[in-house]
Interface confidence: low
């Protein structure tokens, strides 16, 4: 399907205001510290370039790509040396090598100060005032901190925040209406930039085989009655839509994204009953409603799976003839029974089948060599299911805050020579599994909680791979996406560590802790706990409690105290003595 | 399938009322943004008014902002435009459309109703 000019035939299929967005978005993520007045001139110039081509697809330069076109349009900026570095030496290559360039430069963790909230009647004049920039610079703030957001999914959290707005500007109490919605969003935002973050990894790290891989197990999951072709097909697609997101080709990715929308929607009765809903729905939440789908029920006669990939004496006749179909259906018919494995276990079973299959395929008795491939499944499943339970058990136990106290211990001695900032954000976001699944019936907490763990434990690849300082790291990271959990799990004390040196700096606090808020009082908490294990990293958990209820009651008495700042100077310097006695 | 069709159209002295309705079929209409649109004889098109799903949030074009109120009852699955104190240059064709999106940020329109002619004059 070819157009003579491709910025005219996306304008056109997408509108202007998704067109404007996208271009924004797409801009915010490669040049993420440009400030947003000189994005906003650039996407104007694409846009009023984009409808002369609209107009004439003929007119000069319209036959050139979008990548040539954006590229050229980046590499116009001023300041592009001074700001980014050895990006601008992106400019001077070709493409397909400059958008790869640019890509290669993308930086997961900006530096960038943090989103400070204006009080509500602030922001609801700004609204007011003018709607349209105040929106533009939502979706400029979140793209820019989040570079890999999936671009389309960007334009509905930028339609909720509209949305949010609009009905609570006008509330008798606007900060009651408006701040529970913000707060939603933000954690939402967070949840969805992760998971998006781990699919372009999954495609960038371990190509699309792999990614295709999790999509069967997920969409045959998702829709248990729809055939394999069907899923196939789906497959097929979201793999592309991915890719080109992934890969900043966001204009191509929100139009296939909404053709996807169109089909599943037109083709129901062959994937899902529980899609109707969402296909009521106008276009950005359909596509939402549609990736968030609960799972349809199993077909009730589905036969038992050995007599297919066990019991016939054809498996390695059909292995043979097409591996990849083969191992395709074999995932697909495991996941549709299982919607209480997590994908990631899913993917495992899929690996050691097929390992099974490579293995015994080649032996003299074939059949008598995989007969029992079932029963090598068993310890594979139990992992998780164990996994789970004990955590759950803990959290239970423990409660949110001490639970990811326990989690800050257990990885920093994992895994001490990760940054401190890095540790308590990642094991922060470990112990949220707590709140997030173990409240889930037995069926679907494995789900929940794996493939939530897979997301967080992205996030510490993505970030380590930026400044690699661990071996361990870099092993679990990169050599197999589906058993990086197992391999962090697996992961104890680090026996080569040397013990940071005690830095009492590090263990000085000020009166400003009281004006804190819960969380920032928490993550200062944490981050001398982090800084503790790495000091100490074989005290005990009873030690290490010990000095971390010492260091509340502390802060909590300074806190009450007339004259905070000089009861942290006189209690802070005994509080550290006590510390390093008690950790001695 | 999706449809709009609009009624109430006519001939009106200035200064009069009409009110019109669309009627809306084949999709879930409480879930939609509608708007008001209108083309002048000889003229490009113009956004008269839009009115959330739910009916919540109501916005108009500055040239009517006063006179004409829009409604919806999303039970019978229609939409309104009440006008009134109705002037020369409110003569035009007048379209009831659905925007795509829910947000009413955009307007841009995925489907429209046939029209239904208003005429002011003495």
């Known amino acids: 399907d070819t157009h003579k000019s491709e910025v005219a035939h996306r304008f056109k299929d997408l509108g202007e205001e998704h067109f404007k967005g996208l271009v924004l978005v797409a801009f915010s993520q490669y040049l993420q510290q440009c400030p947003f007045e000189e994005h906003v001139k650039l996407v104007n110039e694409v846009t009023e370039f984009a409808k002369t081509c609209v107009a004439d697809e003929s007119a000069e330069n319209c036959d050139k790509s979008l990548h040539t076109l954006f590229g050229d349009k980046l590499c116009t900026v001023a300041t592009l040396r001074e700001t980014y570095g050895e990006m601008a030496d992106c400019c001077a290559k070709q493409e397909p090598e400059r958008n790869e360039c640019f890509l290669q430069h993308k930086d997961d963790n900006p530096n960038l100060p943090p989103l400070v909230r204006p009080e509500v009647d602030v922001m609801c004049t700004a609204f007011h005032d003018n709607e349209a920039t105040f929106l533009k610079k939502y979706l400029y703030e979140v793209a820019r901190r989040h570079p890999y957001f999936y671009a389309p999914e960007l334009l509905f959290f930028a339609a909720r925040y509209k949305a949010a707005f609009a009905e609570c500007c006008q509330a008798a109490d606007k900060a009651a209406c408006l701040l529970p919605k913000l707060d939603e969003l933000r954690d939402e935002g967070k949840a969805s930039s992760a998971k998006q973050r781990l699919k372009c990894a999954s495609l960038q790290k371990f190509g699309d085989r792999a990614f295709k891989a999790w999509a069967v197990a997920r969409l045959s999951q998702k829709f248990p009655k729809a055939e394999f072709a069907e899923v196939s097909k789906l497959v097929t697609d979201l793999t592309k839509v991915h890719t080109e997101c992934c890969h900043g080709d966001l204009l191509e990715c929100a139009d296939d994204r909404a053709d996807l929308a169109k089909y599943m929607c037109e083709n129901q009765d062959s994937i899902s009953s529980k899609l109707k809903e969402c296909c009521d729905k106008p276009l950005l939440e359909k596509s939402h409603c549609l990736a968030e789908v609960e799972n349809d029920e199993m077909p009730a006669d589905l036969p038992s799976l050995a007599a297919d990939y066990v019991e016939s004496k054809d498996v390695c006749k059909n292995y043979a003839e097409a591996k990849d179909v083969f191992l395709g259906m074999f995932l697909y018919e495991y996941a549709r029974r299982h919607p209480d494995y997590s994908v990631m276990l899913l993917l495992r079973l899929a690996k050691a089948y097929e390992a099974t299959l490579e293995k015994c395929c080649a032996a003299a008795d074939p059949h008598e060599c995989y007969a029992k491939v079932f029963d090598e499944f068993q310890p594979l499943v139990e992992e998780p299911q164990n996994l789970v339970k004990q955590n759950c058990e803990l959290f239970e136990q423990l409660g949110e805050y001490k639970f990811q106290n326990a989690l800050l211990v257990r990885y920093t001695k994992k895994v001490p020579q990760v940054s401190t900032p890095t540790l308590v954000e990642v094991s922060r976001n470990l112990g949220k599994v707590g709140a997030k699944c173990c409240k889930l019936p037995e069926a679907k907490r494995m789900p929940c909680a794996e493939d939530y763990l897979s997301v967080v434990l992205n996030r510490l690849c993505v970030l380590h791979e930026k400044t690699p300082v661990s071996e361990k790291v870099t092993k679990c990271c990169t050599e197999s996406l589906v058993n990086r959990r197992p391999c962090f799990s697996a992961l104890e004390l680090d026996e080569a560590y040397v013990p940071k040196a005690f830095n009492a700096e590090t263990f000085t606090f000020h009166a400003d802790m009281c004006t804190l808020s819960e969380k920032e009082k928490q993550v200062k908490k944490q981050t001398a706990l982090v800084e503790l294990v790495k000091h100490k990293p074989k005290a005990t958990k009873e030690q290490l409690k010990g000095v971390m209820d010492n260091f509340a009651a502390f802060v909590e008495k300074c806190c009450k105290a007339d004259d905070k700042e000089a009861c942290f100077a006189e209690e802070g310097p005994k509080f550290v003595a006590a510390s390093q006695a008690a950790l001695a | 399938e999706v449809q709009l069709v609009e009624s109430g159209g006519g001939l009106v002295k200035p200064g009069g009322s009409l009110r019109l309705s669309c009627a809306a079929s084949g999709f879930t209409f409480s879930n939609y943004n509608m708007n008001w649109v209108r083309q002048a004889p000889g003229k490009g098109l113009e956004w008269v008014s839009s009115?959330?799903?739910?009916?919540?949030?109501?916005y108009y074009a500055d040239s009517v902002k006063g006179r004409f109120t829009i409604s919806r009852d999303n039970a019978k699955n229609s939409l309104y435009l009440q006008m009134n104190s109705l002037r020369a240059e409110d003569t035009a064709v007048y379209y009831c459309a659905r925007d795509p999106h829910s947000t009413g940020w955009y307007k841009d329109f995925d489907y429209w109703g046939q029209g239904t002619l208003v005429t002011v004059s003495s």
């Open positions: 009115i959330s799903s739910a009916g919540t949030h109501i």
